[in-house]
Structures are given as structure tokens and as C-alpha cells.
């Protein structure tokens, strides 16, 4: 409980709101309202949010803190930032994984799960765009590989191997004849 504050307070302003009988100063972020002020324009009694709870903004009426969210292990989520008294846990995906939204109109609060990023190297392709907010964008086949169907096939190492037209163009067999 604070001492006597300056009497100039506006109940309709940002800093003081009518709580119970009087216009009271709100609680800072990370604190909840234990008891409203006991005099006009006084300080409310505010307590720090207990562990695993938070309040992100200055508030006047919150008599309890919000529970911190737990990242969904089933959806392969990890905590990018742990919960504090003033901020909720920030869940995301570990390196090498990307966010796949579970709803069509995706916003920051939308439910999501984590998918492993495509490894372009394992597909013998160039990495055109690195995986972060969406899956890796793979480009053309790496040197020594040619497009065949949906994948990249290794250039044959001898003339005995069959080398279709696309293979010949990439692997350079045509020049050998």
C-alpha cells in the first residue's frame, strides 16, 4: 500500500481507474491486484505474479495472473522464450523445423505444429530459400545430378550407363560421341 499520492488524478485517464470505492493507480505489468486502494487516487496493493503466470500490461482489475502456456510437445513445439512475469512463453520450432499453421488464416496466435525442413542436400538439390517460416525451397539439381521424374539422379560414371537427353545435357555425355 503506497503513501498519499498527488490528489490530481483523472478517473477517466490511463493511470487511474475506479476500482471499488475510489480511483486507484493500476498495477504494473507482472503484478496482479491484491486489493484496491483505500483512499482517493491511492496505490492499489499489487503482488508479483507467481511462478508460471504472467500479466503483460499495466492493469487495474486483474485479481489473478494468466497461466503461462505450455508448448505442445505433440506438435513438436519448443519454447523459444521462457515465460516471465511480464510475458507468456513464446513457442516455436527448433532449428531445422518450420511452422505449419493448423488454420487457413494464420496469425501469430493460431495453433500450429512443427514440421521437419526439407534437406535439399539429401535430395541432391540447391537450397534456394532457407527454411524458417515455411519449408525449404529447393532449386535445381546439384552438379553431377540431373532431373529425372521428381528427383535428381546421379550422372553415370561410365559410358555403359544409359543417359537420356536431359542427362546428356547436364552430364556432358553428348560431347563424348
Amino acid at each position: 500500500q503506497g503513501g498519499t499520492r498527488s490528489p490530481r488524478c483523472d478517473c477517466a485517464g490511463d493511470f487511474h481507474k475506479k476500482i471499488g470505492l475510489f480511483c486507484c493507480r493500476g498495477c504494473p505489468a507482472g503484478h496482479y491486484l491484491k486489493a484496491p486502494c483505500t483512499e482517493p487516487c491511492g496505490n492499489s496493493t499489487c503482488l508479483v505474479c507467481p511462478q508460471d503466470t504472467f500479466l503483460a500490461w499495466e492493469n487495474h482489475h486483474n485479481s489473478e495472473c494468466a497461466r503461462c502456456q505450455a508448448c505442445d510437445e505433440q506438435a513438436s513445439q519448443v519454447a523459444l522464450e521462457n515465460c516471465s512475469a511480464v510475458a507468456d512463453t513464446r513457442c516455436g520450432c527448433k532449428p531445422g523445423w518450420f511452422v505449419e499453421c493448423q488454420v487457413s488464416q494464420c496469425v501469430s496466435s493460431s495453433p500450429f505444429y512443427c514440421q521437419p525442413c526439407l534437406d535439399c542436400g539429401a535430395l541432391h538439390r540447391h537450397t534456394r530459400l532457407l527454411c524458417s517460416r515455411r519449408d525449404t525451397d529447393c532449386g535445381t539439381c546439384l552438379p553431377g545430378f540431373y532431373e529425372h521424374g521428381d528427383g535428381c539422379v546421379s550422372c553415370p560414371t561410365s559410358t555403359l550407363g544409359s543417359c537420356p537427353e536431359r542427362c546428356a545435357a547436364v552430364c556432358g555425355w553428348r560431347q563424348m560421341f
Partner: antibody, heavy 123, light 111 residues
Framework: QVQLQQSGGGLVQAGGSLRLSCAAS????????MSWVRQAPGKGLEWVAT????????YFPDSVKDRFIISRDNAKNSLFLQMNSLRAEDTAVYYC????????????????WGRGTLVTVSS | DIQMTQSPSSLSASVGDRVTITCRAS??????????MQWYQQKPGKAPKLLIY???NVESGVPSRFSGSGSGTDFTFTISSLQPEDIATYYC?????????FGQGTKLEIK
């Protein structure tokens, strides 16, 4: 006209409980904070509890905090005082009163009072 | 808590006398230019009745012989011409901050 009709007083053993009621009429009950004030036999007035109008926050002096509960039923224009863990020193006439707010100064005065109800706590 | 000290604790006066009761608060009860102080009258066996609010404002329906004055910590309640029906105990009370506190009362008797 404004009326505050009290009930629920009586004799109770120390450690016991009692619930006082105050039925309000003649004014818009929801627009007023309400209080309880007590007076021990032959003694002065002592504020016991107040409940705010809109959000029903409650306030108590240290002498009754954690033992008394003030509540209101706006639908029934009624005020209540639940008194638990009663002690001999809680023996008094209990009055309910309306708190009128004056102007924009957040200033309250008890402008109407009930007739009082006697609570006797025997040890 | 704000302590309210009232004096005298009792007094005897004659009908027609000017009667003065004082009340001192342990700290200022001023807020935003208003003294958050009131005076109540309690007749024997009856509930208290509000007479004066904000130190000097006479409640509606209260006879004009009752008045109040003062600011900060020192307040005075006056009956300009005592009437037989004024026999009662008078209390000051502050609303500056909780807990609300009353003076111990002044018992007024007719000589």
C-alpha cells in the same frame, strides 16, 4: 422514501457465526456503496465493512478482516454481513448504512441508516 | 489509521446557548480542496443521522442552527441556539482514507 430494514441479530456463542441482512427500498440500490457500522454497549461508533456499488469490492478494518464477509444481492436490493469466529468484543448493535458519494471527489458519507440489530456474543 | 479526537466528551448547556464541539484528526483529511469530514447526531436508542458533510455542508432537511467549519486537521461543529430536541451524542467521522474512523463522541445534555 429511503428505508433500510435490518434483521438477523441475536445471541450466539463465541466462535459461532451469524448472518445479518439489510433490505433496502426507496432508492436505486445498485448505484450506492453500502456499509455496516457497529456500536458496543455504551460505546462509540466503529466502522465494520463497506461494499462498493458496481464491482462489489469489499473493505474491512483489521479488527474483523478475515472473519467478516460483506455481500450484496442487487437483484433483491439486499445487503448482508456474514460474521464468523465471533468474539465477545463483537457484541454490539450493528447498523447498515447507505454511502452517498459527493461530487467528483470520491467522497462518501453515510446518509441513511437502518435502525440497528443487536448481536450478543456470549463467552 | 487516522485518529479522531473529539472534545469535550460531554457537555451541559442551556436552551438557547451556543454550543461548540471540536474534532482533531491525526493527519489532514483534505483531498482536492475538500475536507472529507462529517458530523452525525445520535439520539438515545436511535440510529445516527448525518448532519454535516464535507466539513461545512448542511445535509438536506437539517435545521440551519447546525453548522460546521474547519479544514486540514481541525474542525468545529456548532449549534447556534440549543433546542431541547438537540439532546444527543454527536460524532465526527473522516472519509479521507480507510479505515473510516469516528471520534469518541460528545454527549450533550440540557442544564
Amino acid at each position: 422514501q429511503v428505508q433500510l430494514q435490518q434483521s438477523g441479530g441475536g445471541l450466539v456463542q463465541a466462535g459461532g457465526s451469524l448472518r445479518l441482512s439489510c433490505a433496502a427500498s426507496g432508492f436505486t440500490f445498485t448505484s450506492y456503496a453500502m456499509s455496516w457500522v457497529r456500536q458496543a454497549p455504551g460505546k462509540g461508533l466503529e466502522w465494520v465493512a463497506t461494499i462498493s456499488d458496481g464491482d462489489s469490492y469489499s473493505y474491512f478494518p483489521d479488527s474483523v478482516k478475515d472473519r467478516f464477509i460483506i455481500s450484496r444481492d442487487n437483484a433483491k436490493n439486499s445487503l448482508f454481513l456474514q460474521m464468523n469466529s465471533l468474539r465477545a468484543e463483537d457484541t454490539a448493535v450493528y447498523y447498515c448504512a447507505r454511502d452517498r458519494i459527493y461530487g467528483s471527489v470520491q467522497y462518501y458519507a453515510m446518509d441513511y441508516w437502518g435502525r440497528g440489530t443487536l448481536v450478543t456474543v456470549s463467552s | 489509521d487516522i485518529q479522531m479526537t473529539q472534545s469535550p466528551s460531554s457537555l451541559s448547556a442551556s436552551v438557547g446557548d451556543r454550543v461548540t464541539i471540536t474534532c482533531r484528526a491525526s493527519e489532514s483529511v483534505e483531498f482536492s480542496g475538500t475536507s472529507l469530514m462529517q458530523w452525525y447526531q445520535q439520539k438515545p436508542g436511535k440510529a445516527p443521522k448525518l448532519l454535516i458533510y464535507a466539513a461545512s455542508n448542511v445535509e438536506s432537511g437539517v435545521p440551519s442552527r447546525f453548522s460546521g467549519s474547519g479544514s486540514g486537521t481541525d474542525f468545529t461543529f456548532t449549534i447556534s441556539s440549543l433546542q431541547p430536541e438537540d439532546i444527543a451524542t454527536y460524532y465526527c467521522q473522516q472519509s479521507r482514507k480507510l479505515p473510516y474512523t469516528f471520534g469518541q463522541g460528545t454527549k450533550l445534555e440540557i442544564k
